[in-house]
């Protein structure tokens, strides 16, 4: 996981701060007992902002120690600061917990930029604004880190919600969500509604604001409109999916669909941007540039280096295209599309020097590790991680930022052939052939 472009901190306001809250539409599929309905105690349990991550409050140990924990669907370790650090307001003090058990094993996690390392143990963990359960979970107590914690952030750890295959040091370390499902009656599913603010938030606004919801064990009707559409989880490691087509303002990028998933496509709440493989990024930028050519933006804007600004309240959203990703559907030869607006891929940035204007950063960037559907995508949708049925659901988020002319959309079905060919098969090192 590339910590450099990956998130770490906080998000917008609940509801539809700037944007019109969409009306409820008709009911979707038949009810599934225990899997949907109202989860009032979990609604609005996330805070943060898209540029620095979304966090949930958790308690660890006995007596409970409260920590803010970054919600990350792109990793699989539950890891918390466990030693003083200049950027941490508080940290997990194992010696104060009567239920802490040392696993006498270390863990080291390097990123492209930076790293964290620590000691493995288990302890009792609960989520105050989550299901009313306590579980014994693996915890990596971070004792040393470099470029991991963020100055001025409000979180002290990370909750990796992906699968055991990518857990460190190896896949024998059971991730938190697996422990939760095994030890309780919580269904094997969670859903995320990340609410981008649509405008920059200062520190005090962030701390006082709501950033969305993590519904553990179910689906909350109030958080989305229209229907939920599901795409298969291709492989249980990251939350890997298959993109079969990409359109900019309805114009097909016309690339071999393997390029869209080279070397994988994942849904990752721990990444800010929509990250695209080099070739796809270049084609997408070319197309977005062409669509928005009524204004001349600096090259640095497309690189994420320069901001673009407009006089407050005059952002010309209409000159920017919508972006549609077609995802493999659950039925053979059927796909559906998710469509985001510039309100999702232009990220509001507060800059004192230009405070009289509304300024934005282009939040689509280049990747060397495949497509990453980060907060930029997720802020448009209510995303259901249905692990039990090995699928991810998308519906239009009730809190997504939009204008009076366009909204994000989830639409289908579309007929798409040979979708299996769109998946890239990462070459596996056959260790059995290595000399020992």
């Amino acid at each position: 996981t590339q910590h450099g472009i990956r998130l770490p901190l906080r998000s917008g306001l609940g509801g539809a701060p700037l944007g019109l809250r969409l009306p409820r539409e008709t009911d979707e599929e038949p009810e599934e007992p225990g899997r949907r309905g109202s989860f009032v105690e979990m609604v609005d349990n996330l805070r943060g902002k898209s540029g620095q991550g979304y966090y949930v409050e958790m308690t660890v140990g006995s007596p409970p120690q409260t920590l803010n924990i970054l919600v990350d669907t792109g990793s699989s370790n539950f890891a918390v600061g466990a030693a003083p650090h200049p950027f941490l307001h508080r940290y997990y003090q194992r010696q104060l917990s009567s239920t802490y058990r040392d696993l006498r094993k270390g863990v080291y996690v390097p990123y492209t930029q930076g790293k964290w390392e620590g000691e493995l143990g288990t302890d009792l963990v609960s989520i105050p604004h989550g299901p009313n359960v306590t579980v014994r979970a693996n915890i990596a107590a971070i004792t040393e880190s470099d470029k991991f914690f963020i100055n001025g952030s409000n979180w002290e750890g990370i909750l990796g919600l992906a699968y055991a295959e990518i857990a460190r040091p190896d896949d024998s370390l059971e991730p938190f969500f697996d422990s939760l499902v095994k030890q309780t009656h919580v269904p094997n599913l969670f859903s995320l509604q990340l609410c981008g603010a649509g405008f920059p938030l200062n520190q005090s606004e962030v701390l006082a604001s709501v950033g969305g919801s993590m519904i553990i064990g179910g689906i909350d009707h109030s958080l989305y409109t229209g229907s939920l559409w599901y795409t298969p989880i291709r492989r249980e490691w990251y939350y890997e999916v298959i993109i079969v087509r990409v359109e900019i303002n309805g114009q097909d990028l016309k690339m071999d669909c393997k390029e869209y998933n080279y070397d994988k496509s994942i849904v990752d709440s721990g990444t800010t941007n929509l990250r695209l493989p080099k070739k796809v990024f270049e084609a997408a930028v070319k197309s977005i540039k062409a669509a928005s050519s009524t204004e001349k933006f600096p090259d640095g804007f497309w690189l994420g280096e320069q901001l673009v600004c407009w006089q407050a309240g005059t952002t010309p959203w209409n000159i920017f295209p919508v972006i549609s990703l077609y995802l493999m559907g659950e039925v053979t030869n059927q796909s559906f599309r998710i469509t985001i607006l510039p309100q999702q891929y232009l990220r509001p940035v507060e800059d004192v020097a230009t405070s009289q204007d509304d300024c934005y950063k282009f939040a689509i960037s280049q990747s060397s590790t495949g497509t990453v559907m980060g907060a930029v995508i997720m802020e448009g949708f209510y995303v259901v991680f249905d692990r039990a049925r090995k699928r991810i659901g998308f519906a239009v988020s009730a809190c997504h930022v939009h204008d009076e002319f366009r909204t994000a959309a989830v639409e289908g079905p579309f007929v798409t052939l040979d979708m299996e060919d769109c998946g890239y098969n990462i070459p596996q090192t056959d260790e059995s052939t290595l000399m020992t």
Partner: antibody
């Protein structure tokens, strides 16, 4: 308050290297790119290159490739520029400047004098 | 590389006058031009971005205009503290380039 605090004056020998620093404060360091600009005595401004602190991606002016190397330390919020194989042509004031729209914030500058 | 030309190297004005500093780009840079003021022995100070937007805290005596290839910084009601070098910069494409500067002297 946003500040870019640069390291002090350097008097260096020809052929050697020097590493200048620029410590940022008052904003999230990894959110904005850092640029370096050269100004020779009584002359104009020349863009050297830039670095993205979040990914350590760099982009150099062709004229400074091989001369300047840009790095960052995100844990301390500091950007660095190393200048190598110094000659009298490298005697100048070097500024770091933060991205935004153009360069809204500038450091106070570091004077480098190359002399034997 | 885009060349930014400030044809006037020096300008001399009296307090209260209006002065126009011009800058010409060798190719179309849209409105992606900034202006900086540099007083003797100091670092550059940002004045104008996007050709005509004032940075926060810049007095409204400073006005930018232009697009494409021709840009102007106008200082009305010139004050003695405006004694400085003024540089234009294009940030439309890499490498970013600056004009050679115009020195404003106060009579």
């Amino acid at each position: 308050e946003i500040q870019l605090q640069q390291s002090g004056t350097e008097l260096v020998r020809p052929g050697t290297s020097v590493k200048l620093s620029c410590k940022a404060s008052g904003y999230t360091f990894t959110n904005y790119w850092m640029h370096w600009v050269k100004q020779r005595p009584g002359q104009g401004l020349e863009w050297i290159g830039m670095i993205d602190p979040s990914a350590a991606y760099t982009n150099y002016n062709q004229n400074f490739k091989g001369k300047a190397t840009l790095t960052v330390d995100t844990s301390s919020g500091t950007a660095y520029m190393q200048l190598s194989s110094l000659t009298s042509e490298d005697s100048a004031v070097y500024y770091c400047a933060r991205s935004g729209v153009a360069f809204p914030y500038w450091g106070q500058g570091t004077t480098v004098t190359v002399s034997s | 590389d885009i060349v930014m030309t400030q044809s006037q190297k020096f300008m001399s004005k009296s307090v209260g006058d209006t002065v126009s500093v011009t800058c010409k780009a060798s190719q179309d840079v849209g409105r992606n031009v900034a202006w900086y003021q540099q007083k003797s022995g100091q670092s550059p100070k940002s004045l104008i971005y996007s050709a005509s937007h004032r940075y926060s805290g810049v007095p409204d005596r400073f006005t930018g205009s232009g697009s494409g290839t021709d840009f102007t910084l106008t200082i009305s009601n010139v004050q003695s503290e405006d004694l400085a070098d003024y540089f234009c910069q294009q940030y439309n494409s890499y490498p970013y380039t600056f004009g050679g500067g115009t020195r404003l002297e106060i009579k």
